[in-house]
Amino acid sequence: QSSLTPLMVNGILGESVTLPLEFPAGEKVNFITWLFNETSLAFIVPHETKSPEIHVTNPKQGKRLNFTQSYSLQLSNLKMEDTGSYRAQISTKTSAKLSSYTLRILRQLRNIQVTNHSQLFQNMTCELHLTCSVEDADDNVSFRWEALGNTLSSQPNLTVSWDPRISSEQDYTCIAENAVSNLSFSVSAQKLCEDVKIQYTDTKM
């Protein structure tokens, strides 16, 4: 991406990503420099008759670095610390072309869980306090609670009253999403409230 705005590329933690490099048409390339956060990553000298010379200058990422035939950068086994700014400088006899990228690493969401802190009132109405969580959630995770296709909450928490005398069986579903994955977990209001009722009657006896 040679414009002022870097190309934003999404990578998934533990997987691979390619930063695509476009060559100036019909020009002989003298060398290519890849930089990560302004520090040299690799220096490549292409040859017409033999394999290119590739000098990896960053030992930290070195083992996970690869280059395609067109010298696009491939980074495998992505880590959170790979997040940042990448630049490729293609030098020809007449010019230097710069391509900029921003790599962000996203986690596949894992381990969705719902915790329940519910109360039973004397009128037998059950008030559900549900909290949804996923492992290593960050600010890019969106949570919502749904029932019968309606969104009841846009946060990890849901507070809702359920009256078994007037409400039919009801499932509440937490959906956690980010740009690369989504998970859901459903709980039954009837089951949760029955559990609370048992605890309630046990403490009364």
Epitope: L7, M8, V9, N10, T102, R104, D139, N140, S142, F143, R144, W145, E146, T151, L152, S153, S154, Q155, P156, N157, L158, T159, V160, I175, E177, N178, A179
Partner: antibody, heavy 118, light 106 residues
Framework: QIQLVQSGSELKKPGASVKVSCKAS????????MNWVKQAPGQDLKWMGW????????RYADDFKGRFAFSLDKSVNTAYLQISSLKAEDTAVYFC???????????WGQGTTVTVSS | QIVLSQSPATLSLSPGERATMSCRAS?????MHWYQQKPGQAPRPWIY???NLASGVPARFSGSGSGTDYTLTISSLEPEDFAVYYC?????????FGGGTKVEIK
């Protein structure tokens, strides 16, 4: 019906503070995140951040860290935006907006105009 | 942050004409939301999750797209459709809006 009603226009001097309120009605306040959006005169919309209305935890966009503070009064279903050390560039309309999920802002306040002028 | 570029900045059309506006993201996003804003008013929710019309939005509006390219289309412009339309992404924080497309009467 579901609505967000914001406080009235404010005229402030540079260096002063302002507190904008956003009163929610018609839904369970603590179930939906509240976002704040800035629109400077003739400009685009800029997301300032949001507050979790259940936990009270605010999250700010990078450009709005420092002088900006989100808060709640759950007893009256109201969210607040406070701006301190006001500058001329804070002159704008500020909107509160409810997050319906996936950061889709389905209900907006009418906007509060804050003018900073000496 | 993800930059949203809307084009064209202005669409000058007559009632009855078809309007198509684009929103391009600097990185792939899962869905796009759209809002309509008229002078002196708050934005109104218009299309959510790429293609779902908000309550009360007429069927002449439609949304489509995936990845980095999204489109809002008005099949036949009515007088009340002349306004500014903003796209907004939710995939990454900070949530960002596009610069808007103004649909004006020719």
């Amino acid at each position: 019906q579901i609505q967000l009603v914001q406080s009235g226009s404010e005229l402030k001097k540079p260096g002063a503070s302002v507190k904008v309120s956003c009163k929610a009605s018609g839904y369970t306040f603590t179930n939906y995140g509240m976002n704040w959006v800035k629109q400077a005169p003739g400009q685009d919309l800029k997301w300032m951040g949001w507050i979790n209305t259940y936990s009270g935890e605010p999250r700010y966009a990078d450009d709005f860290k420092g002088r900006f503070a989100f808060s709640l009064d759950k007893s009256v279903n109201t969210a607040y935006l406070q701006i301190s050390s006001l500058k001329a560039e804070d002159t704008a309309v500020y909107f509160c907006a409810r997050d319906y999920g996936r950061w889709y802002f389905d209900v907006w306040g009418q906007g509060t105009t804050v003018t900073v002028s000496s | 942050q993800i930059v949203l570029s809307q084009s064209p900045a202005t669409l000058s059309l007559s009632p009855g004409e078809r309007a198509t506006m684009s929103c391009r993201a600097s990185s792939s996003v899962s869905h796009m939301h759209w809002y309509q804003q008229k002078p002196g008013q708050a934005p109104r929710p218009w299309i959510y999750a790429t293609s779902n019309l908000a309550s009360g939005v007429p069927a002449r509006f439609s949304g489509s797209g995936s990845g980095t390219d999204y489109t809002l289309t008005i099949s036949s412009l009515e007088p009340e459709d002349f306004a500014v339309y903003y796209c907004q992404q939710w995939s990454s924080t900070p949530r960002t809006f596009g610069g808007g497309t103004k649909v004006e009467i020719k």
